[in-house]
Every structure is written in C-alpha cells, then in structure tokens.
C-alpha cells in the first residue's frame, strides 16, 4: 500500500482542518486507512480520524481543532494498520480556507438598487472576523455568458448594485465567498446561491 | 501543568442526588477533546460512566447502565465539567475521577472518545442511610 | 463489547518478563489502552493505541496486538511496577469505553 498524492491539509481556523490525499491503487479507506494527529505540545491527546473515500483511489479526513491559535502545529501520520505510511506536519494558520460565507439574501425593494447581504461565518471573537473580504458572483439564470464577479474589498458584508446593471425581465442568482489576505487565505467554497427576479423597469424615455 | 480537580463528594442517602464538579486548568475545556467521568468501588475496578466533547458541539456518551440516573454537562465559561447523579444507591458508593479524553472521528458528525489521559485526584461518594 | 483480563493476579520478581492479556467481545481495531494504578492514585496511562507509549512511560512497557487480542508486556521487572493493571477498550459502533478486571503484579514470595 502506497501513498501517491502526500495530504494536503486546509483550515477553517476555527474547529475544523480537512485533509486529503491520493493512494497508488483502489483504496476503502475507511476499512484500511487511519489518519492520527496530535498538536505539538507537552502533553496533548493523540487524536484520529477514519478516513472517507474521495473517488476510488482519494481519501479525506476531517481534523477537530478547536481554538485554534497561530503557534498551533500538528503532527500528522498516515496507518494502515501498524504500517506508517507518511509522517508530516500541520500548521494551520498558514493554510487557512476560510468557511463560506452565510444567509446571502437579496432585497430587491429599495428604489433602483440591490441589496445583496450575507453574513461572516465566524464569531466576533475568532481571527478572521475582521480579516474577511469577499466576492459575489451574479449570473443569469438562463445565460451562462452572462455573468459578473464584485469584488467587496471592505468588511461589511453588503453589496449595493444598481438594478439597470442587470438586463430586465430576467431570473437572476447570486453567491458569495470570503478570503482572508492577512493569512494568506484561499478563497472559501461558494455560499448556496439565491435567486430573485430582476423587474427593473427602464425608465420611460420623452423626446 | 494541566490539571483535573474533582469536588462534590460525600455522604448521601440512598434516593438522593449530588453534583459533582471537575475544574480543569492548564488548558482551554472548550478544546478539541472529550471530558468524561470513571468511578472506582472500595476495592473493585475502574467503571466509565460518560464523556461530553469539549469544544462547541457538546455531543454526549453514555455507559447503558447509567443512562437516565447520570448527566454530564459542562459550562465552558468556568472550564469546568458536571455529572448530576440521581436516584443514587448503595452500589453507588465509588471514587469519581475526572479524566480527559482522546477521540476518534468520521467524517464531521461522527466523533467519539477513545482513551483516557489526564486524571484527577478523584472524590469519594458514599451512598448510606 | 466486554473486555476479558488475564491473569486476575501473578506474581513476580523484580528482572522478571511478565505478560498480561486482554480479549475483546468484539473487533475493536487499535482502540485499546492500558493503565496502571497504585493504591489511592488515579490511572496512569501507559499506552494508547494498542502500541504507543505514553508520554514520559518507561520503554520496559510495551503494547503489541489488534483486533479482538492484546498484550501488554514489561520487559524487566522493576520495583515500581508492583500495582494493578487495566486495560480499556473502545468501540466506535457504540461509542463505549469498557474496563478489564484488572491484573494485580505482586511480589513473589
């Protein structure tokens, strides 16, 4: 049994790291595979996860961390059976995926405008509460062409965009992520995506 | 130094109830890891009784035996963990320590505690008329 | 699950290689530690995972097995080791924790 892909670890810096890797063959990873980490401390439990099947040959695991700070190292070994298979390290502040951002609404009553707002995933009391800045995506529902992205490069999670932007009579969908530039953050996974109905009325022209 | 100090103990009638306490210090109880209650009787062995994940989720473990008389619960804020015994009887009478756990976990829903590491001293309930 | 030790006691002198068993009712993988207690004292963990040795346990202890079998093994006896030992097994299907009886290690003679 052979590792092909060494995991690759991500943090949402807050309770929760995912790891994932690739394995030379089929592989139930469940059955055969044990991820054991432990943090870099004197005396820490040694924690472990059963791995879950990511495709035939990928595995993922789901690492608790809670209160997480940035010293915060791990060690990582990868067991089949009393086999090791790969031994490596963990430190999450330096591979923070933020969570999705939550609750995107949109109101479509306020004059001429869109409200898009969301809400930041983490508690005012985490790191990343203030770090986040985000991108929303608004498509046509029934043109892929037709799509935009709006970067929010400030911290509240609102976006205001004139209804006349958006072609009328037409069903529209947003979603929205966050990052973290500070940390060095990739981008979090899309939020679940709102749709509303964009009945903006050109205003009658007089000539 | 990561300490476990357990309190609450003492004389009580069969029938009754008692709360015992367990104060953890030398390190965050809301973390990643499971704070659980083992009782000894006068000469016998070692007997789980429960274990509450410490960080946000809370998810509880239960002997089957202790289902229903014993409930662990926690308060975050005081880093401390509880187990309320009720209807308590004679067989009762034991050492209860405190103990932090290790865990095992599948996938994000499925966690569970799977060896004990840390230790308090223990406190003695007697359970007589 | 139900956890079986043997022996209940032995004895033994200090230098001696001494062995005691765990069985379990039912597969629990590597989920096994084992403990050793002196009188008044709380547990204290020796090893975890059915192999690893705790922080700080002399290397004369060692776990080997998996499965339903464990052993727990000291190499050379020495005088601090006279206590009883337990071990604890874990099963993920039911999120219990389960005790053996223990093993009492006396001085022989």
């Known amino acids: 049994m052979k590792v092909l892909q060494e995991p690759t670890c991500v943090s949402d810096y807050i309770s929760l790291s995912t790891c994932e890797w690739k394995m030379g063959g089929p592989t139930n990873c469940s059955a055969e595979l044990r991820l054991v980490y432990q943090l870099v401390f004197l005396i820490s439990e040694t924690n472990m996860c059963v791995p879950e099947n990511n495709g035939a040959a990928g595995c993922v695991c789901h690492l608790f961390m809670e209160d997480m700070v940035g010293a915060d190292n791990y060690t990582l070994d990868l067991w089949a059976g009393q086999q090791l298979l790969w031994k490596g390290s963990f430190k999450p502040s330096e591979h923070v995926k933020p969570k999705a951002p939550e609750n995107l609404t949109v109101y479509t009553n306020v004059s001429e405008t869109l409200l898009l707002t969301w809400s930041n995933p983490y508690p005012p009391d985490n790191y990343l509460y203030e770090k986040l800045t985000y991108a929303v995506n608004i498509w046509n529902e029934n043109d892929p062409t037709d799509s935009r992205i709006y970067d929010v490069t400030y911290q509240e999670p609102t976006l205001r965009i004139a209804a006349s932007t958006l072609k009328s009579g037409v069903s529209y969908r947003a979603r929205v992520r966050a990052w973290a530039q500070s940390y060095n953050s990739t981008w979090s996974e899309w939020s679940p995506s709102t749709k509303w109905y964009n009945a903006y009325k050109e205003p009658f022209e007089k000539h | 130094e990561s300490q476990l100090v357990e309190s609450g103990g003492g004389l009580v009638q069969p029938g009754g109830s008692l709360r015992l306490s367990c104060a953890a210090s030398?390190?965050?109880?809301?973390?990643?890891?499971?704070m659980c209650w083992v009782r000894q009787a006068p000469g016998k062995g070692l007997e789980w009784i429960a274990c509450i994940y410490a960080g946000s989720r809370g998810s509880t473990y239960y002997a089957s035996w202790a289902k229903g008389r014993f409930t662990i619960s926690k308060d975050n804020s005081k880093n401390t963990v509880y187990l309320q015994m009720n209807s308590l009887r004679a067989e009762d009478t034991a050492v209860y320590f405190c103990?932090?756990?290790?865990?095992?976990?599948?996938?994000?829903?499925?966690?569970?505690?799977?060896?004990?590491?840390?230790w308090g001293q223990g406190t003695l309930v007697t359970v007589s008329s | 699950i139900q956890m079986t030790q043997s022996p209940s006691s032995l004895s033994a002198s200090v230098g001696d290689r001494v062995t005691i068993t765990c069985q379990a009712s039912?597969?629990?993988?590597?989920?096994l530690a084992w403990y050793q207690q002196k009188p008044g004292k709380p547990p204290k963990l020796l090893i975890y995972r059915a192999s690893t040795l705790a922080y700080g346990v002399p290397s004369r202890f060692s776990g080997s097995g998996s499965g339903t079998d464990f052993t727990l093994t000291i190499s050379s006896l020495q005088p601090e080791d006279f206590a009883t030992y337990y071990c604890?097994?874990?099963?993920?299907?039911?999120?219990?924790?389960?005790f053996g009886t223990g093993t009492k290690v006396t001085v022989l003679g």
């Open positions: 604890l097994g874990s099963s993920y299907s039911t999120g219990s924790n389960i």
């Open positions: 039912e597969d629990i993988e590597s989920y």
């Open positions: 030398g390190f965050s109880s809301s973390s990643a890891h499971y």
């Open positions: 103990a932090r756990a290790a865990f095992v976990n599948r996938g994000v829903s499925w966690i569970w505690p799977y060896y004990f590491s840390l």
